[in-house]
Amino acid sequence: EKSDLRTVAPASSLNVRFDSRTMNLSWDCQENTTFSKCFLTDKKNRVVEPRLSNNECSCTFREICLHEGVTFEVHVNTSQRGFQQKLLYPNSGREGTAAQNFSCFIYNADLMNCTWARGPTAPRDVQYFLYIRNSKRRREIRCPYYIQDSGTHVGCHLDNLSGLTSRNYFLVNGTSREIGIQFFDSLLDTKKIERFNPPSNVTVRCNTTHCLVRWKQPRTYQKLSYLDFQYQLDVHRKNTQPGTENLLINVSGDLENRYNFPSSEPRAKHSVKIRAADVRILNWSSWSEAIEFGSDDGHHHHHH
């Protein structure tokens, strides 16, 4: 489990405490409070300041990571005096025992895999557990299917992403009978971790002078409009000399995805394949299966 807390202030002052499960920082309410604020500072000198709760004696953080260690701070003014208290939140347990090389990716629009490696100093009996919360912290998902290596959990497969939002909090806790295990946590945007399938329903229609390629945008986990897609077409003439460059064409997403290019008869055999990406990320999907068109005698006009 996550670490104990050390306060840097007289113990009598505010009695600041932090609950990592709810991300709630609270302190003893003071009479005649005129001003209060809470915030944290992380190792990158990032300051995160949430809104105070209605009772003004607690606040709940949303978009924060804790594994590198953070310092919470509470400032309270009353009509009589001012209070300030810091709370160091270290990642207790032996250094190097936390899960490392953590990554997740969403694929096929509704599946997700997360993987990690055991910490280099973790004992043989270490066991890791993954918990996921959406960034609003309203729901916790426990890993339903672990991927194991010699009995140690080193990954997780999810086939129900309904509890996720656009940004999610991932926590890998560790346990051991021998020593304390550090935790690892991360905030991941679904935008960054989704891997698109290649475009579907790729067709090529040719007339005497042109060929028209059409395709459908891939189904995605994120709710995206056609404007969010970028495509790359690889139009390749068959039987060319090795080392001949393929023609790579960039096409922006449209309501109806199509690319029309000049190609007169008789038409040599060509192939076309397409891949997709989010315009703001450019994490390319794999290529669609190659569709062939044209022929050595130039008689074929329509290809699926």
């Epitope: 990032r46 300051v47 809104r51 953080f61 949303r62 978009e63 656009s166 703001r280 450019l282």
Partner: antibody, heavy 123, light 107 residues
Framework: QMQLVQSGAEVKKPGASVKVSCKVS????????IHWVRQAPGKGLEWMGG????????NYAQKSQGRVTMTGDTSTDTAYLELSSLRSEDTALYYC????????????????WGQGTLVTVSS | EIVMTQSPATLSLSPGERATLSCRAS??????LAWYQQKPGQAPRLLIY???SRATGIPDRFSGSGSGTDFTLTISRLEPEDFAVYYC?????????FGQGTKLEIK
């Protein structure tokens, strides 16, 4: 189409405070994260921080600590940047900005910008 | 934080010419890069995101390329309205950071 309209120019004395507003139209404030970017005269752009009006969380660099407050009024779809203990080096154009895909710590490109508010700090 | 360095600081060209602006990141930002245009007295305008995708309404004479640490904004044929200051910005790592700008001026 989304628009961000900022309040007018301000001239302040050192040590004073200023509150710049950014009125959103074409969207409700709670759907957005509002970011503030400043530009000193003749200089480049500097990200100051981001604010989530729905849950009130602010994310900013430590050098802004204690002097910068970002707030929002969801009833009027207006975001605010308050700067206290003003110094001459705070003289700058202050822009609010947002994008189609944002959180409090960044945007995947700032698609929409206010027109800027010039704050001049001079004794 | 990631430092974005733009070059040249000033580029003097004539309308009709091709402009090539460079931006280098102090560490890899993948393709998480945007370009902005700013004219005097105006707010910046988003031109490119994802290193190479044009924002809505941006003419196709503007193109972006690169990934990792080295990026280029190219304006194929300069129009009189293209003379402005151009900024690159990374959104891969916190905090988001901008380059110091390249001023594109009429020769």
């Amino acid at each position: 189409q989304m628009q961000l309209v900022q309040s007018g120019a301000e001239v302040k004395k050192p040590g004073a405070s200023v509150k710049v507003s950014c009125k959103v139209s074409g969207h409700t404030l709670t759907e957005l994260s509002i970011h503030w970017v400043r530009q000193a005269p003749g200089k480049g752009l500097e990200w100051m921080g981001g604010f989530d009006p729905e849950d009130g969380e602010t994310n900013y660099a430590q050098k802004s600590q204690g002097r910068v407050t970002m707030t929002g009024d969801t009833s009027t779809d207006t975001a605010y940047l308050e700067l206290s203990s003003l110094r001459s080096e705070d003289t700058a154009l202050y822009y609010c900005a947002t994008g189609r895909y944002c959180s409090t710590d960044t945007c995947y490109g700032f698609d929409y910008w206010g027109q800027g508010t010039l704050v001049t700090v001079s004794s | 934080e990631i430092v974005m360095t733009q070059s040249p600081a000033t580029l003097s060209l004539s309308p009709g010419e091709r402009a090539t602006l460079s931006c280098r990141a102090s560490q890899s930002v993948s393709s998480y890069l945007a370009w902005y245009q700013q004219k005097p007295g105006q707010a910046p305008r988003l031109l490119i995101y994802g290193a190479s995708s044009r924002a809505t309404g941006i003419p196709d004479r503007f193109s972006g390329s690169g990934s990792g640490t080295d990026f280029t904004l190219t304006i194929s044929r300069l129009e009189p309205e293209d003379f402005a200051v151009y900024y690159c910005q990374q959104y891969n790592n916190w905090p988001p950071t901008f380059g110091q700008g390249t001023k594109l001026e009429i020769k």
